[in-house]
Interface confidence: medium
């Protein structure tokens, strides 16, 4: 009967660096002739082991082939590399000149298991902005067998890739994978991560992960606001420029005065928000006594090499108020003056005329009357310092408010003159902590005759610190 060559395993998987055995048995030692092992078939097949001749350092017999009647021609390959992958054939030859092949085993395919490299996630070269779609690519290489799973996640949510390819498509010793996913950025993504997860038989259900921090790929531009704070003293106006919720930190802030650079800020102490973005506040003290004309202050913010964001704020000079008046400020986020300035001035003039007419009318009534009467009027002070100003404009107010400075010393106040019984006395109560409604437009007439005094004991207590302006009007 014809000799039969048996290779029991159709395939075997072995880890790179490990050893494997390729089994081969024959049913007869006849006809006389050697057994050889080859990888591959045809002309290009490679001799792996020949028991009688040649030097094969990593291959050796499993059993003792020198023993009589040995029919086991299994071989052991040590320190397997991915290049050892392929189909191995145990082939029986008949001795001759040359030897002739008479029978071959069915072949055993050797799969060399190789771990994938840690996945590398790459993103766009330039930072994207919220609502922009950006692509991320994940690459891993050097794995075998070809079967592999790749998943994308953003903050725990699985994402669907645009495409995933494993190359080469044919048989190879090892393979590479590349996958692309599209992510829509949002302003809350500074702390977000995009994760590429690779699972392979060699990893024991412990996937490899590649991580891209979106903080490296996102730009959140700041919102810039200029506001005016309450004056700390007579001749100072505090301007604040606030850049909010920006990322990355790279920020330059410049104050300009009528278009000329006044101060350059390189922010150091940024405050960090929980979403990973930053805030920065720059204070600018304006010396009001130095300006008689209107001044446009500009806060110019350059973020992450992007075009500058500018916010203007107009401060009206002395020419717009009484001799003792403090400066007025107007937010102006355009290059031109805010129309509110003109509307405000018009309203102020109109009210001034009305007040003058009212004053004249009162004087006429007083002249007619034989006996005086007392009436009381209250004017609300909106901000902190009642001493210095009667009205501070909120930068968000739409209406223009013109005001005069009471400029009263804080020291010892003169004792109030006792009003005569027939005098007409009016009280202007200036209460701290109360903010006027934006629609209240106040214009004050000349207060030559105003005397400021501590409030006399009142029938009911005042809700906050109050000062009274007592206006004495003599009856003619």
């Amino acid at each position: 009967t014809e000799v039969k060559v048996t290779q029991p395993e159709k395939s075997v998987s072995v880890a790179a660096g490990d050893s494997t055995i390729l089994n081969c048995t024959v049913t007869s030692l006849l006809p006389v002739g050697p057994i050889r092992w080859y990888r591959g078939v045809g002309q290009s097949r490679l001799l792996i082991y020949n028991q009688k001749e040649g030097h094969f350092p990593r291959v050796r017999n499993v059993s003792d082939t020198t023993k009589r009647n040995n029919m086991d021609f299994s071989i052991r390959i040590s320190n397997v590399t991915p290049e050892d992958a392929g189909t191995y054939y145990c082939v029986k030859f008949q001795k001759g000149s040359p030897d002739t092949e008479i029978q071959s085993g069915g072949g055993t395919e050797v799969y060399v298991l190789a771990k994938p490299s840690p996945p590398e996630v790459s993103g766009p070269a330039d930072r994207g902005i919220p609502d922009q779609k950006v692509n991320f690519t994940c690459k891993s290489h050097g794995f075998s067998p070809r079967n592999i799973t790749l998943k994308w996640f953003k903050d725990g949510q699985e994402l669907h890739p645009l495409e995933t390819t494993v190359n080469p498509s044919g048989k190879n010793v090892s393979y590479n994978i590349s996958s692309t996913v599209r992510v829509v950025l949002n302003s809350m993504d500074v702390n977000s991560k995009v994760i590429c997860e690779v699972a392979h038989i060699t990893l024991d259900r412990s996937p490899l992960r590649g991580i891209a921090n979106l903080s490296n790929f996102i730009r959140v531009s700041p919102t810039v606001k200029v506001t005016q704070q309450s004056p700390t003293s007579m001749n100072q106006v505090n301007l604040t420029c606030r850049a909010e919720r920006f990322y990355p930190e790279d920020l330059q802030l410049i104050w300009l005065e009528n278009g000329n650079v006044s101060r350059n800020d390189t922010p150091k102490n940024l405050t960090k928000n929980t979403d990973g973005t930053y805030n920065y506040t720059s204070l600018f003290l304006v010396n009001s006594s130095a300006h008689r004309e209107d001044v446009v202050f500009t806060c110019q913010v350059k973020h992450d090499q992007q075009p500058a964001i500018t916010r203007n704020h107009t401060v009206l000079g002395f020419a717009h108020s009484s001799d003792q008046g403090s400066m007025q400020t107007f937010p102006d986020n355009n290059a031109t003056h805010n129309w509110n300035v003109f509307i405000g001035v018009g309203v102020a003039c109109a009210l001034l005329v009305v007040l003058l007419m009212a004053a004249l009318y009162l004087l006429r009534i007083k002249q007619k009357k034989a006996k005086g009467s007392t009436s009381s009027t209250r004017l609300h002070e909106p901000e902190k310092n009642a001493r210095e100003i009667t009205q501070i404009q909120d930068t968000n107010d739409i209406n223009d408010i013109t005001y005069a400075d009471l400029n009263l010393p804080k020291e010892k106040k003169p004792a109030p003159r006792a009003p005569e019984p027939n005098n007409h006395t009016e009280y202007a109560s200036i209460e701290t902590g109360k903010v006027p409604r934006p629609e209240d437009t106040l214009t004050y007439a000349d207060l030559d005759m105003v005397h400021l005094s501590r409030a006399q004991p009142a029938p009911k207590p005042e809700p906050s610190f109050s000062e009274y302006a007592s206006v004495q009007v003599q009856r003619k």
């Epitope: 395993e9 395939s11 075997v12 072995v14 490990d18 050893s19 494997t20 040590s78 771990k115 060699t202």
Partner: antibody, heavy 120, light 107 residues
Framework: EVQLVESGGGVVQPGRSLRLSCAAS????????MIWVRQAPGKGLEWVAS????????YYADSVKGRFTISRDNSKNTLYLQMNSLRAEDTAVYYC?????????????WGQGTMVTVSS | DTQLTQSPSSLSASVGQRVTITCGAS??????MHWYQQKPGKQPKLLIY???NLEAGVPSRFSGSGSGTDFTLTISSLQPEDFATYYC?????????FGQGTKLEIK
Amino acid sequence: EVQLVESGGGVVQPGRSLRLSCAASGFTFSDYGMIWVRQAPGKGLEWVASISSSSSYIYYADSVKGRFTISRDNSKNTLYLQMNSLRAEDTAVYYCARRYYGFNYPFDYWGQGTMVTVSS
Amino acid sequence: DTQLTQSPSSLSASVGQRVTITCGASKSVRTYMHWYQQKPGKQPKLLIYSASNLEAGVPSRFSGSGSGTDFTLTISSLQPEDFATYYCQQSNEPPYTFGQGTKLEIK
């Protein structure tokens, strides 16, 4: 003659640790993958962990992952199983076995086993 | 994970009888199915590897067949020393699962 001898078993309280050893002889230890299999009293066989000859490929059963660690010292021809955070359900006879060359081959030689009892 | 189900769970047979034990896999394990014999108080012993290959030193009355998801261990003529518990095991991919075992008893 191929021999595998396990040691290190005993009675231990839940939450405690134990380290099992398996001394190999009669074959080239560094050529073979090794495994641990356990058998709870009156129950079937359960594969616990395996390690390739070069220690580059290690696998665990879900039931022990994160608690047990398989390792080997080829210079000492010894296989180890470090068992931490032991539970009552880990009570079993633990066998070490040799895996014939290659991932897909069977476990051709087994040790006699060592008993681990987890009890308070 | 690949689940292996052996049937029957237990079996009573007489010496000289032909016995067949089957093992079903929840998914294909190709030909990477092995059979072990275990006697009480002893370690398991390899009988058949890669579905149909007889391990060295194992009597020829033991044979195995099958591929994919269905496998069979056959003992052509039961001998007194064959009464034991038999397990199938797959090594296609980790975790390397075992069947629940088939206990073969003397009738």
